[in-house]
Interface confidence: medium
Amino acid sequence: EVEKTACPSGKKAREIDESLIFYKKWELEACVDAALLATQMDRVNAIPFTYEQLDVLKHKLDELYPQGYPESVIQHLGYLFLKMSPEDIRKWNVTSLETLKALLEVNKGHEMSPQVATLIDRFVKGRGQLDKDTLDTLTAFYPGYLCSLSPEELSSVPPSSIWAVRPQDLDTCDPRQLDVLYPKARLAFQNMNGSEYFVKIQSFLGGAPTEDLKALSQQNVSMDLATFMKLRTDAVLPLTVAEVQKLLGPHVEGLKAEERHRPVRDWILRQRQDDLDTLGLGLQGGIPNGYLVLDLSMQEALS
């Protein structure tokens, strides 16, 4: 803590301006009124204070607002935001998207810090759900944001927000997250025509059930192998060779390169070798001709 000392004669700050960069820490503490600082926070960002000097300014605000800063101050924190701890931020009530954007801008280009994570958490909880504008903003700054949420948190995302999601926003999502997002995406894009619908839904297909994949196979979508490899194994296994051929279109030839990897490997093991041979790709490992295929899934469900 900075010790209390009297302000030297003639040094009392009448406004927040560049002259303050010449003030020692103790002079800032003694000569800058906290209320003046709070009303002129927007100026702080334009002044090249040292980090030590910023420590003093933060200390003054902390003394003025021990219960947490008001939004009028938070919105203009600028680089002073980098000085805040998650504990500081938990005291805030941030409701304005403009405030959120202003603070995210300060951290732009860096990994999501604990401070930013806390800020976003406070903001989203205050709003009650991840609306489209918020999601737009968060994914613009942090493309991986959506995939950092738990399936429970994702359940609060309204289908209308899905329009804001870009393919790269889902790169790090795991199957449990896509299970939650896919039905929302399906609802969001339901009124689009076939080819447009596929373009939009493609990134979410890691959460699609078998029946939806069967339906897509009837629409000449030409799914690429990268998308196919991200599908749920349990959704791919029941597809017939003909359905996979229709689903992939000209990309079907890529199955050969992926025959040792899931879900292709597991799918091959479920197909008749005769059927696989019709693809002319030399895929091996199917059920030999003359073998009886039993569907044990019903028996397992009953036992």
Partner: antibody, heavy 120, light 107 residues
Framework: QVQLQQSGPGLVKPSQTLSLTCAIS??????????WGWIRQSPGRGLEWLGR?????????DYAVSVKSRITINPDTSKNQFSLQLNSVTPEDTAVYYC??????????WGQGTLVTVSS | DIQMTQSPSSLSASVGDRVTITCRAS??????LAWYQQKPGKAPKLLIY???TLQSGVPSRFSGSGSGTDFTLTISSLQPEDFATYYC?????????FGQGTKVEIK
Amino acid sequence: QVQLQQSGPGLVKPSQTLSLTCAISGDSVSSRSAAWGWIRQSPGRGLEWLGRIGYRSKWMNDYAVSVKSRITINPDTSKNQFSLQLNSVTPEDTAVYYCARMQGFQLDYWGQGTLVTVSS
Amino acid sequence: DIQMTQSPSSLSASVGDRVTITCRASQTISSALAWYQQKPGKAPKLLIYGASTLQSGVPSRFSGSGSGTDFTLTISSLQPEDFATYYCQQYYSYSVTFGQGTKVEIK
């Protein structure tokens, strides 16, 4: 493009005053966004920041603790330059002295440097 | 004062090499760090400030990283004009201080 041109003697006797001048082109010594500083470099002490001045509705300065009692930096607005005076020099003050423009504490433009030797 | 320690103090490298210089602060300085390049008989030149922001006009082969106490200057592919001495400088504190320098020589 900002340029800084240094001038001053290269030899000073012990106990005397070292005086150097830095002429600015491409910016103003009275700029409210920059400050103007002096730095020195010697084999023994490496790079050492000495002090700075800047105009912020009035002239302001601050100096490194190590030289605070001996240093003065002054502006000359009519010639758009600033000067360094270091009193009571000793051989320890032998160094290459640089002037520089400071944005905050980042030194983005430097003078060419002046080797000052303190010797009798 | 905050002490800045650079390593190595010198290194030998060839044109095209990737070169890494580290700078450690004696206490946390957030990202208040600058890097300078100095050639013999010349003044230092600002390369990077804010730990990672490239100064205007500096080639993109130079990059900086780090925060807190540990920082790195990287030259992705060393060029003939890059043989010089490199200094880090902290400006977290009012008393700015520099590292002792790292000399990059031709192997």
